[in-house]
Interface confidence: low
């Protein structure tokens, strides 16, 4: 197809040779009401299009990406020729940096609904350069951690050496979606949650006397848990008395939640108190019943083959412990009446 009608955008990727990083291109197809590239503007108000006009990037799910070879050869389908470039919906992911990624990338909708849509395309001229030694030595990493539950910030690597005052206006995206309120070179997160994790893109415009281009950097942000500062808490049993039937078997479950610890050595055990005596009970092994990045719920049961009168005088104590401390919950058995 003829790409002369495509809108053009110039981008610069300056990558660090010291770290692995990746890059993305968005298929920023022009909004029909803002651009002469898509056909809605070519209709007078009285004309009614036979097909729905192309709606721009908001409802864009199916686009085709091409690379334009520098020697003038025909356009190449990205998916067939470039294994280190992966298309995900309307985003192109470059998994490895390198000057060989420089070139012209074209995207357009897969479904051409009318002759006018042929010109509904974007040409992105990407220049890729290694960072020079003269560049800032302590630039922000392309991989940044945020500690869950605390305050944190995400810095734009290409601007992290500049003060907030001298920084140009920055456009931020998270997982391909525009973060419209963020305009500075640093996003401050008041309280970090799981959903702050993702792929962030920061763009700013740089100009010289001849032209202007977008400088883009990609930051992978991970939310991490610090080692817990809490001792485990017992979720069950909640009550300190339990109604039972004499002569019947009984299982009492102790469920405890342990916060994340890098060196994890949980203890969960049952012991029995009988007047001044106290002893640990041999009970089935503990089981993990729920496991997440932040905590683990472990269960351990005590099983009585049949409840006796003596059991009513005892206290059954669940004891749980981590490196921070321990928690106990005792249960007194009470005969069911009637």
């Amino acid at each position: 197809f003829n790409i002369s009608g495509c809108s053009t955008k110039k981008l610069l990727w300056t990558y660090s040779t010291r770290s692995e990083e990746e890059f993305v291109l968005f298929c920023d197809l022009p909004e029909p009401q803002k651009s002469h590239f898509c056909h809605r503007n070519r209709l007078s108000p009285k004309q009614v299009p036979e097909h729905l006009p192309f709606m721009g990037s908001n409802d864009l799910s199916d686009v085709q990406w091409y690379q334009q070879p520098s020697n003038g050869d025909p356009l190449e389908d990205i998916r067939k020729s470039y294994p280190h470039i992966i298309q995900d919906k309307c985003t192109l992911h470059f998994l490895t940096p390198g000057v060989n990624n420089s070139g012209s990338y074209i995207c357009r909708p897969k479904m051409i609904k009318s002759p006018y849509d042929v010109a509904c395309c974007v040409k992105m001229i990407l220049e890729v350069k290694p960072q020079t030694n003269a560049s800032c030595e302590y630039s922000a990493s392309h991989k940044q951690d945020l500690l869950l539950g605390s305050t944190g910030s995400i810095s734009c690597p290409s601007l992290s050496c500049q003060s907030d005052a001298q920084s140009p206006a920055v456009t931020w995206y998270k997982n391909g979606k525009l973060l419209s309120v963020e305009r500075s070179n640093r996003i401050v997160v008041d309280e970090v949650y799981d959903y702050h994790q993702g792929t962030y893109v920061c763009d700013y415009t740089q100009s010289d006397t001849v032209s202007s281009w977008t400088v883009r950097a990609v930051v992978q942000v991970r939310t991490i848990v610090g080692d817990t500062k809490l001792k485990p808490d017992i979720l069950d049993p909640v009550e300190d008395t339990l109604e039972v039937e004499l002569g019947k078997p009984l299982t009492i479950s102790c469920k405890a939640r342990f916060g994340f610890e890098r060196v994890f050595n949980p203890v969960i055990k049952w012991y029995i108190k009988d007047s001044d005596l106290e002893w640990e009970v041999s009970v089935p092994e503990a089981k993990s019943i729920k496991s997440t990045l932040k905590d683990e719920i472990i269960e351990r049961n005590i099983i009585l083959e049949k409840v006796t009168q003596r059991d009513l005088r005892r206290k059954f104590v669940c004891f749980v412990q981590n490196s921070i401390g321990n928690t106990t919950q005792s249960v007194q058995l009470k005969e069911k009446r009637g």
Partner: antibody, heavy 118, light 110 residues
Framework: QEQLKESGGGLVQPGGSLKLSCKAS????????VSWVRQAPGKGLEWVGY????????YYASWVNGRFTISSHNAQNTLYLQLNSLTAADTATYFC???????????WGPGTLVTVSS | ALVMTQTPSSVSAAVGGTVTINCQAS??????LAWYQQKPGQRPKLLIY???NLESGVPSRFKGSGSGTEFTLTISDLECDDAATYYC????????????FGGGTEVVVK
């Protein structure tokens, strides 16, 4: 249902290369670290390497010596193992295994067999 | 490098009996140890993690113990279905997690 499924194994000549894939389904790939583990015929399990899925930082067993590369693509829920400069000693079933909350592997794929032979 | 030494390499016991498998770490790994069961042609199956925690759905006949550098897997009331190879696996942190498996122990049930 949570699953891992390896593919890409096959016969390759000594000195050749191969790229293995591990496709995850039924869980959010970006919340778990994943390892590659291999097992030569009739031998024990051998840890190859591990990748942090969000930052795609990879760590390897010392014997790998830069011949293997682990990468991942979260959006496609897929993990990769690029095998280069293969020798007969690399003949094995390659498993991908998901790391649990701490340092254990609680979900394994069925494995894919790589045979290096002329 | 972290080295896991598993003994014995093979053990035989009768149905209803007990077998004990040992695993020694070359450095302190606290409780970062797991045990797996693997049958011929199958993927490994997690039995125990954190040295002594039983994975959900695993019979309580399997018991893990130990911490630091010495660990034990005990299988009591042996069943025919327990015939398999058992592996210990550990992790330690340097700047990142590094994992290692023991050499395996074949359990034969008579």
């Amino acid at each position: 249902q949570e699953q891992l499924k390896e593919s890409g194994g096959g016969l390759v000549q000594p000195g050749g290369s191969l790229k293995l894939s591990c496709k995850a389904s039924g869980f959010d790939f970006s919340n778990y670290g994943v390892s590659w583990v291999r097992q030569a015929p009739g031998k024990g399990l051998e840890w190859v390497g591990y990748i942090d899925p969000v930052f795609r930082s990879a760590y390897y067993a010392s014997w790998v010596n830069g011949r293997f590369t682990i990468s991942s693509h979260n959006a496609q829920n897929t993990l990769y193992l690029q095998l280069n400069s293969l020798t007969a000693a690399d003949t094995a079933t390659y498993f991908c295994a998901r790391k649990g909350y701490f340092h254990y592997f609680n979900l394994w794929g069925p494995g894919t067999l790589v045979t290096v032979s002329s | 490098a972290l080295v896991m030494t598993q003994t014995p390499s093979s053990v035989s016991a009768a149905v209803g009996g007990t077998v004990t498998i040992n695993c020694q770490a070359s450095q302190n790994i606290y409780s970062n140890l797991a045990w797996y069961q693997q049958k011929p042609g199958q993927r490994p199956k997690l039995l125990i993690y954190g040295a002594s925690n039983l994975e959900s759905g695993v019979p309580s006949r399997f018991k893990g113990s130990g911490s630091g550098t010495e660990f034990t897997l005990t299988i009591s009331d042996l069943e025919c279905d327990d015939a398999a190879t058992y592996y210990c696996q550990s992790a330690y942190y340097s700047s990142s997690a590094v994992y290692a498996f023991g050499g395996g122990t074949e359990v034969v049930v008579k």
